[in-house]
C-alpha cells in the first residue's frame, strides 16, 4: 500500500506564438482545479477507461478574473498535493491523465458551470520511494508543470511497496530468514501478513491481505474442503465402480465469485474478476469510491471518500447518468422559445432568437411599438415582432408621416367623382347612384336601394365618407 503524490507547479500559456485566451473574464470569473487518473502499466487506454490505480480531485483554486487586454498569465492554483492512495503493490510502470478544469462563477443556466480546459497524458516508469520526478506537458497552447512521486505507507517498503518492515525485536539481528530493511537498517523485513482468519494449514498469501487456498480447499479463508474423497485425482471424489473418473467440483464450480464476478482457475485455487463497484477475493466487498474512478467521459467525482459514503458524478456538457455514461443533448429539452436556436456552450446554454424575439429563452415578443410613435394621430399595432401603424385619415406610410391622397385608390364607384376633404374624402355620385361610395343604384321609381336616405340628404347629393 502507498500513495501517489502529484504537485502542480504552474498552469499557464506555453512558449511560442498564439498565447491562449484567459479562461476567465470579468464577465465570467472562474477558478481552476485538477483531476488526476492513474492506470497500471504503459497502457494506451482511452481517457474514459477506469482509473484502475485510483483517481483524485484537487481543491478549488483562488477565484481569478482576467485583466482586460492582458495576456493569460500563469493561473492561480489550488493549495496542496493531489494524493492517490493505492491498496496493492505499486506497479512500477503507470499511465496518468491530468485534467485542468475551470469552474465558472457567473450565473449559469443548465447545471454546474464546469468545463475541461486541458488534458495531458503520459506513460512513465517510477519506483516507489524514489525522489520527486519533474515533468512538463503541453495541451494546445497551455503548459502544465508538475512533479510526482510514489511513496509507501508503513509498514510497506521497497520499489513496489510489497515488502513489510517491523522494528527489530533484537538489537543485533533479524529473525531467521528475514533481512534488514534497507534503507531502514534498524528495521527488519516482516513475514507477509495474510488476510485475517486465513487458514494457516490450507491457505497462504503472496500479497499482504490475501488468502489463497491449497488444492482441495476453497472459501474466502480456505476452510471449506472441495472434496470428501481421498482420491488422488485432483478433480475429486471417486466412484465405487469407476474409481477416480467422475469429475468433482473444480475451484470455479458453482462460481464462488459473488455479485456477477467471473471465476478463473489458478494453479492453486481460483481468481475472481469483479465488476465495477465490487472487489475482494470473491467480489463480496461492495462500495465504489471516487478512487475507483467511477465517472466516465471526464465526469468529476465528488464525495465517496470511503465505501460507506456515496459518490456523485458531476457530468460535463453533453453527458448524463449516474456515471456520466449516457450522451445527452441538453438542447433536446428545447429550452428556447419561439423557434430560437439552442447553443450548448459547455458552461451555459444560450438561445439565439429569431427576428422579433428576445430574452434569455427568446420568450419576449419584441414590443416594436415602444418608443416608435406613429405620427399624425396614427396608432401602433404589434404583430410578429414587426410594428405597423394604422394611420388616421389623410396619412399613410410606415409611420403615418406621408400625406395620403384619399382619392388615389379611386374609392367612388359607378363613375362618381372623388374630392379630397380635410377629414377624408367625398364622392360626388353620377346620376342614378348614391351612398358614401356611390355604391347604391337609385331605382327608376325614385326609391333607392337604401331603406331610407339620411335626413337632409337627397339621393344624388354628394355623400361625405366618414
Amino acid at each position: 500500500a502507498g500513495v501517489f503524490e502529484l504537485q502542480i507547479h504552474s498552469f499557464g500559456p506555453g512558449p511560442g506564438p498564439g498565447a491562449p485566451r484567459s479562461p476567465c473574464s470579468a464577465r465570467l470569473p472562474c477558478r481552476l482545479f485538477f483531476r488526476v487518473c492513474l492506470k497500471p502499466g504503459l497502457s494506451e487506454e482511452a481517457a474514459e477507461s477506469p482509473c484502475a490505480l485510483g483517481a483524485a480531485l484537487s481543491a478549488r483554486g483562488p477565484v481569478y478574473t482576467e485583466q482586460p487586454g492582458a495576456p493569460a498569465p500563469d493561473l492561480p492554483l489550488p493549495d496542496g498535493l493531489l494524493q492517490v492512495p493505492f491498496r496493492d503493490a505499486w506497479p512500477g510502470t503507470f499511465s496518468f491523465i491530468i485534467e485542468t478544469w475551470r469552474e465558472e462563477l457567473g450565473d449559469q443556466i443548465g447545471g454546474p458551470a464546469w468545463s475541461l480546459l486541458a488534458r495531458v497524458a503520459g506513460r512513465r516508469r517510477l519506483a516507489a520511494g524514489g525522489p520527486w520526478a519533474r515533468d512538463i506537458q503541453r495541451a494546445g497552447a497551455w503548459e502544465l508543470r508538475f512533479s510526482y512521486r510514489a511513496r509507501c505507507e508503513p509498514p510497506a517498503v521497497g520499489t513496489a511497496c510489497t515488502r513489510l518492515c517491523r522494528p527489530r525485536s533484537a538489537p543485533s539481528r533479524c529473525g531467521p530468514g528475514l533481512r534488514p530493511c534497507a534503507p531502514l537498517e534498524d528495521e527488519c523485513e516482516a513475514p507477509l501478513v495474510c488476510r485475517a482468519g486465513c487458514s494457516p494449514e490450507h491457505g497462504f498469501c503472496e500479497q499482504p491481505g490475501e488468502c489463497r487456498c491449497l488444492e482441495g480447499w476453497t472459501g474466502p479463508l480456505c476452510t471449506v474442503p472441495v472434496s470428501t474423497s481421498s482420491c488422488l485425482s485432483p478433480r475429486g471424489p471417486s466412484s465405487a465402480t469407476t474409481g477416480c473418473l467422475v469429475p468433482g467440483p473444480g475451484p470455479c464450480d458453482g462460481n464462488p465469485c459473488a455479485n456477477g464476478g467471473s471465476c478463473s482457475e489458478t494453479p492453486r485455487s481460483f481468481e475472481c474478476t469483479c465488476p465495477r463497484g465490487f472487489y475482494g477475493l470473491r467480489c463480496e466487498v461492495s462500495g465504489v469510491t471516487c478512487a475507483d474512478g467511477p465517472c466516465f467521459n471526464g465526469g468529476l467525482c465528488v464525495g465517496g471518500a470511503d465505501p460507506d459514503s456515496a459518490y456523485i458524478c458531476h457530468c460535463p456538457p453533453g453527458f448524463q447518468g449516474s456515471n456520466c455514461e449516457k450522451r445527452v443533448d441538453r438542447c433536446s429539452l428545447q429550452p428556447c422559445r419561439n423557434g430560437g436556436l439552442c447553443l450548448d456552450l459547455g458552461h451555459a446554454l444560450r438561445c439565439r432568437c429569431r427576428a422579433g424575439f428576445a430574452g434569455p429563452r427568446c420568450e419576449h415578443d419584441l414590443d416594436d411599438c415602444a418608443g416608435r410613435a406613429c405620427a399624425n394621430g396614427g396608432t401602433c399595432v404589434e404583430g410578429g415582432g414587426a410594428h405597423r401603424c394604422s394611420c388616421a385619415l389623410g396619412f399613410g406610410g410606415r409611420d403615418c408621416r406621408e400625406r395620403a391622397d384619399p382619392c388615389a385608390a379611386r374609392p367612388c364607384a359607378h363613375g362618381g367623382r372623388c374630392y379630397a376633404h380635410f377629414s377624408g374624402l367625398v364622392c360626388a355620385c353620377a346620376p342614378g347612384y348614391m351612398g358614401a361610395r356611390c355604391e347604391f343604384p337609385v331605382h327608376p321609381d325614385g326609391a333607392s336601394a337604401l331603406p331610407a336616405a339620411p335626413p337632409g340628404l337627397r339621393p344624388g347629393d354628394p355623400q361625405r365618407y366618414l
Partner: antibody, heavy 122, light 107 residues
C-alpha cells in the same frame, strides 16, 4: 485541429440544382451548430443558413428561404446544402463555418472552410 | 432584422498608422460581435470574438471594443500584412448579418 472542407460547387444553369458538402474533422461535430456563408464575386459576406448540432433546428436568409435546405449527417461528420431553383444572383463562393458562438471554446484550426465556387449561368 | 453599418467603406493608410474601423448595429446586440480579416482570394480569418476578445494567434496590435450598438476594431500600428478588407458580424439574433466591409489600402 479543426478542419472543414467543402465540395460540390460548379457551373449550373438557372433553375438547376446543386448539393454542397462540408467534411468536418478535429472536433466533436455533433456538438456544434454550423453555418453556410456566401460571398458573391467582389462583394461582401452574406449569411445563408444555420443548423443546430442535432440537426433539429434550421434557419435561412430570406433570399434563399424555400429554395435551399441545410442538413447534416453527424455519423459522417458532414454538413450539406441542397440548392434548388438556382438564380444568377446565387453565384458566389460558399463557405461552411462553425458557428461564431463557439469562438471562445475551440482554439486550434480553421473555423471556415476554403470555400467552393457556385456559378449560375446559362 | 439587425442592420450592421460599417464605416468607412474604404480608407488609405500607411505602415505604422493607427487605424480605427467602426460597426454600428441598428439595435442592441450586447457583445455578440466578431471581426474578420479577408485578403483577396482567401478565406475570412477571425480576429476578435465577443466584441473585445482577441482570437488565439492574432497579433496584439488588433483590439476590439464596444457593446450594445457601437463597436470598434483598432489596429494600433498598421503592418504591411494588415492591408486587407475587414468585416464585422453580429450573431446576437437571426438573421446573422455582416457589415459591408472596410477595405484598408496602402496610401
Amino acid at each position: 485541429e479543426v478542419q472543414l472542407l467543402e465540395s460540390g460547387g460548379g457551373l449550373v444553369q438557372p433553375g438547376g440544382s446543386l448539393r454542397l458538402s462540408c467534411a468536418a474533422s478535429g472536433f466533436t461535430f455533433s456538438s456544434y451548430a454550423m453555418n453556410w456563408v456566401r460571398q458573391a464575386p467582389g462583394k461582401g459576406l452574406e449569411w445563408v443558413s444555420t443548423i443546430s448540432g442535432s440537426g433539429g433546428s434550421t434557419y435561412y436568409a430570406d433570399s434563399v428561404k424555400g429554395r435551399f435546405t441545410i442538413s447534416r449527417d453527424n455519423s459522417k461528420n458532414t454538413l450539406y446544402l441542397q440548392m434548388n431553383s438556382l438564380r444568377a444572383e446565387d453565384t458566389a463562393v460558399f463557405y461552411c463555418a462553425i458557428d461564431p458562438e463557439y469562438y471562445d471554446i475551440l482554439t486550434g484550426g480553421d473555423y471556415w472552410g476554403q470555400g467552393t465556387l457556385v456559378t449560375v449561368s446559362s | 432584422d439587425i442592420q450592421m453599418t460599417q464605416s468607412p467603406s474604404a480608407m488609405s493608410a500607411s505602415v505604422g498608422d493607427r487605424v480605427t474601423i467602426t460597426c454600428r448595429a441598428s439595435q442592441g446586440i450586447s457583445n455578440y460581435l466578431a471581426w474578420f480579416q479577408q485578403k483577396p482570394g482567401k478565406v475570412p480569418k477571425r480576429l476578435i470574438y465577443a466584441a473585445s476578445s482577441l482570437q488565439s494567434g492574432v497579433p496584439s496590435r488588433f483590439s476590439g471594443s464596444g457593446s450594445g450598438t457601437e463597436f470598434t476594431l483598432t489596429i494600433s500600428s498598421l503592418q504591411p500584412e494588415d492591408f486587407a478588407t475587414y468585416f464585422c458580424l453580429q450573431h446576437d439574433s437571426f438573421p446573422l448579418t455582416f457589415g459591408g466591409g472596410t477595405k484598408v489600402e496602402i496610401k
